[in-house]
């Protein structure tokens, strides 16, 4: 009796259970009682990751400069290429078909993580004895000055946004 | 259904070329099988000749030396033999196969 | 190239008898695939070869199930469970794993 299912990395076609392509191969021609499934690799910019039954191979990612993009990792015959964003720029979303700009943290606000090619920079509120006075991608909240350990005094207290003026102590006359 | 049937002389003289085709219907000879030539001498053993495949490209018995050619005509959907510089021990029934469907055969004398 | 050897040659079989045909290759009809291209045929007086097995024990479509196909690597056999009168023909093994194909010379099988 013809199959009605076949073995792992095998398909049914017309009675007839035939190998399927390794990755980095499509397929030529199926099987038949007398021939194996015949295979021809993907030509420079295609690939195919998985064992199948394709005609056709997939291209390779482009990753366009215009969009803000970069290879990270060129393609195989096996993989897809790999796009990250260019310094500066992340990716919009998983797939990274194109990047936007870092976003900065404002004053009062300081960068927990800094931003890669794939992730955003993530901003935290200065906590109180913190602050940030500038927009940047980078900068982190700094600690208010300490005017005790410069034998000085607060005359202005700091905030989230601003440090605090150390000032000469009173003297006792 | 599958079909397949020979065409040629059934008489050629020693030294000339022979000729045949075998007209395929109910398949397209642009699909994956391979398309063979198969002979049998009179009250003898079958003979694998050669094959061409869905793609043109194809492989010979190198018993036929460099006698033997099997060339496509997609357009009619047959494909053909020649063969060169006979001799009366090329006196056979010619098949032309898929090998699970076969023409009917037709007889070509070698002699002058 | 790959020689197959058929045994016996003669096979006189009384009607409703089991009948076997053995088949030997001089090297194995295994591919790197794990696929072994051994055919049976079956050639009635008059009349062109009829696939019978394929892949050394696949059926083909229409063949009645008293025929069966076993073996492996260099040794195969061809099994009728019950012969009947129109059994009766040349039966011939091919292998297509390796090229040039080649046949087997052929067991005659004939009523007692």
């Known amino acids: 009796e013809p199959p009605t299912a076949c073995r792992e990395k095998q398909y049914l076609i017309n009675s007839q259970c035939c190998s399927l392509c390794q990755p980095g191969q499509k397929l030529v021609s199926d099987c038949t009682e007398f021939t194996e499934t015949e295979c021809l690799p993907c030509s420079e910019s295609e690939f195919l990751d998985t064992w199948n039954r394709e005609t056709r191979c997939h291209q390779h990612k482009y990753c366009d400069p215009n969009l803000g993009l970069r290879v990270q990792q060129k393609g195989t015959s096996e993989t897809d290429t790999i796009c990250t964003c260019e310094e500066g720029l992340h990716c919009m979303s998983e797939s990274c078909e194109s990047c936007v700009p870092h976003r900065s943290c404002l004053p009062g606000f300081g960068v927990k993580q800094i931003a890669t090619g794939v992730s955003d920079t993530i901003c935290e509120p200065c906590p109180v004895g913190f602050f940030s006075n500038v927009s940047s991608a980078f900068e982190k909240c700094r600690p208010w000055t300490s005017c005790e350990t410069k034998d000085l005094v607060v005359q202005q207290a700091g905030t989230n946004k601003t440090d605090v003026v150390c000032g000469p102590q009173d003297r006792q006359r | 259904q599958v079909q397949l049937q020979e065409s040629g002389p059934g008489l050629v003289k020693p030294s000339d070329t022979l000729s045949l085709t075998c007209a395929v219907s109910?398949?397209?000879?642009?699909?994956?099988?391979?398309w063979n030539w198969i002979r049998q001498p009179p009250g003898n053993k079958l003979e694998w000749m050669g094959y061409?495949?869905?793609?043109?490209?194809?492989n010979y018995n190198p018993s036929l030396k460099n006698r033997i050619t099997i060339s496509v005509d997609t357009s009619k959907n047959q494909f053909s033999l020649k063969l060169s510089s006979v001799t009366a021990v090329d006196t056979a029934v010619y098949y032309c196969?898929?090998?699970?469907?076969w023409g009917q055969g037709t007889l070509v004398t070698v002699s002058s | 190239d790959v020689v197959l050897t058929q045994s016996p040659l003669s096979l006189p079989v009384t009607l409703g008898q089991p009948a076997s045909i053995s088949c030997r290759s001089s090297?194995?009809?295994?591919?790197?695939?794990?696929?072994?291209?051994l055919n049976w045929f079956q050639q009635r007086p008059g009349q062109s070869p009829r696939l019978l097995i394929y892949?050394?024990?696949n059926r083909f479509s229409g063949v009645p199930d008293r025929f069966s196909g076993s073996g492996s690597g260099t040794d195969f056999t061809l099994k009728i469970s019950r012969v009947e009168a129109e059994d009766v023909g040349v039966y011939y093994c091919l292998q297509v794993t390796h090229v040039p194909f080649t046949f087997g010379q052929g067991t005659k099988l004939e009523i007692k």
């Open positions: 090297q194995s009809l295994e591919n790197s695939n794990g696929n072994t291209f």
């Open positions: 109910g398949y397209s000879i642009t699909t994956n099988y391979y």
């Open positions: 892949k050394v024990s």
């Open positions: 196969a898929r090998l699970d469907y």
């Open positions: 061409i495949k869905y793609d043109g490209s194809n």
